[in-house]
Amino acid sequence: MAVTACQGLGFVVSLIGIAGIIAATCMDQWSTQDLYNNPVTAVFNYQGLWRSCVRESSGFTECRGYFTLLGLPAMLQAVRALMIVGIVLGAIGLLVSIFALKCIRIGSMEDSAKANMTLTSGIMFIVSGLCAIAGVSVFANMLVTNFWMSTANMYTGMGGMVQTVQTRYTFGAALFVGWVAGGLTLIGGVMMCIACRGLAPEETNYKAVSYHASGHSVAYKPGGFKASTGFGSNTKNKKIYDGGARTEDEVQSYPSKHDYV
């Protein structure tokens, strides 16, 4: 029961974590204009992995994508790669872990197979979480490095854009979402790995008994095969779960001249 709970909780925690990683990757607020003390400008700049946005006090918000690939800093590309790898590994991990859940029975899948799948998904979640944490941390480090360089944008030269204003950028909401989500995915992965140990059926330790037949000396070891081989039907301690798969069912804005948003 504890194993099932650990596995289920690990799956749920990882699911939330991966959803968070996806959300963080898509968010525009990776870096936001530093508003410490007073706003220097009447526009608010913020940037994501894929586009930069400007919000005026009029309420008008405009976002522009980074349409160049080669012109982007290597660090930004690395962060993108880490986040995408994290999402892909997490998604595969989720897929694998769904079939590994003890409460879902698929054909005649043995516990050992489920244990292996649980371990695989756990490792995937751990790597996914680490990728997200690493990606967010690399970006945060970029921000810290560039924070005091108030006369230069961290994407200077990107797509021919030159920063001409003294704008400093600080941590955006996406960084905190990414760190938390990465941590949750990591914790979920660890829980899956712990659950794997409880899922793996232990080898039945019967003492070897020798049967002496006339003219032959053959030693038989009952229960000598592990359940993972698929031989034998050691159903004595095997629990059959009759449970089907359970499914549980979230730019640019314009103010009107006559309607200030």
């Epitope: 400008t41 400007v54 522009r64």
Partner: antibody
Framework: QVQLVQSGAEVKKPGASVKVSCKAS???????VHWVRQAPGQGLEWMGE????????NYNEKFKKRVTMTRDRSTSTVYMELSSLRSEDTAVYFC???????????WGQGTLVTVSS | DIVMTQSPDSLAVSLGERVTLNCKSS????????????LTWYQQKPGQPPKLLIY???TRESGVPDRFSGSGSGTDFTLTISSVQAEDVAVYHC?????????FGGGTKLEIK
């Protein structure tokens, strides 16, 4: 039709305070309203802004110690109070509604404040 | 504070003439994030509040005649009236809409000869 209607002209003595109102009609009263003044024969001078939604305000450092901007959401009215009046505060005071590019698309008709002993 | 310098202070032109008004800011008004210049032009007639003509340095406000056009980037901006009409007699103000405090130029007075 969008309108910003300001209160009438005021005559004040030096050291006194004046409170000018600006009532908005014809649009949703949710974004920054700015105050600009113009001394006779002079240019325009930005005093500050107030967000009617949350009453947050930003003031020109020159007026920070003397100006207070408030709002009354129930009547869609913003107020600008200037204290410790001096003769050089004699000017026409305008309220203005913000638009694209942080420009001022809609202006009140102006309120003449005369500071004289 | 950002200093906005307008030139000339005043000018008198003939009807139908092309006129160029200049505005220079002490710092660049270009925002790198959206590549827009936060400079606005207003027209003010005697006894009236200013009227919005151009925002983002070159975007004409709806209802403004197309003889008015704005150009420039960074620190240097111009307002051009391709063919001056009698109703264009006014004071023209440029405004920094980017840095706090938002500042205005001293104005250029346009008159008809």
């Amino acid at each position: 039709q969008v309108q910003l209607v300001q209160s009438g002209a005021e005559v004040k003595k030096p050291g006194a305070s004046v409170k000018v109102s600006c009532k908005a009609s014809g649009y949703t009263f949710t974004n920054w309203v700015h105050w600009v003044r113009q001394a006779p024969g002079q240019g325009l001078e930005w005093m500050g802004e107030i967000n009617p939604t949350n009453a947050r305000s930003n003031y020109n450092e020159k007026f920070k110690k003397r100006v207070t901007m408030t709002r009354d959401r129930s009547t869609s009215t913003v107020y600008m109070e200037l204290s410790s009046l001096r003769s050089e505060d004699t000017a026409v005071y305008f309220c203005a509604g913000i638009y694209y590019g942080n420009s001022f698309a809609h202006w009140g008709q102006g309120t003449l404040v005369t500071v004289s002993s | 504070d950002i200093v906005m310098t307008q030139s000339p202070d005043s000018l008198a032109v003939s009807l139908g003439e092309r006129v160029t008004l200049n505005c220079k800011s002490s710092q660049s008004l270009l925002n790198a994030g959206n590549q827009k210049n936060y400079l606005t032009w207003y027209q003010q007639k005697p006894g009236q509040p200013p009227k919005l003509l151009i925002y983002w340095s070159s975007t004409r406000e709806s209802g403004v005649p197309d003889r008015f056009s704005g150009s420039g980037s960074g620190t240097d901006f111009t307002l051009t009236i391709s063919s001056v009409q009698a109703e264009d007699v006014a004071v023209y103000h440029c405004q920094n809409n980017y840095y706090y405090p938002l500042t205005f130029g001293g104005g250029t007075k346009l008159e008809i000869k």
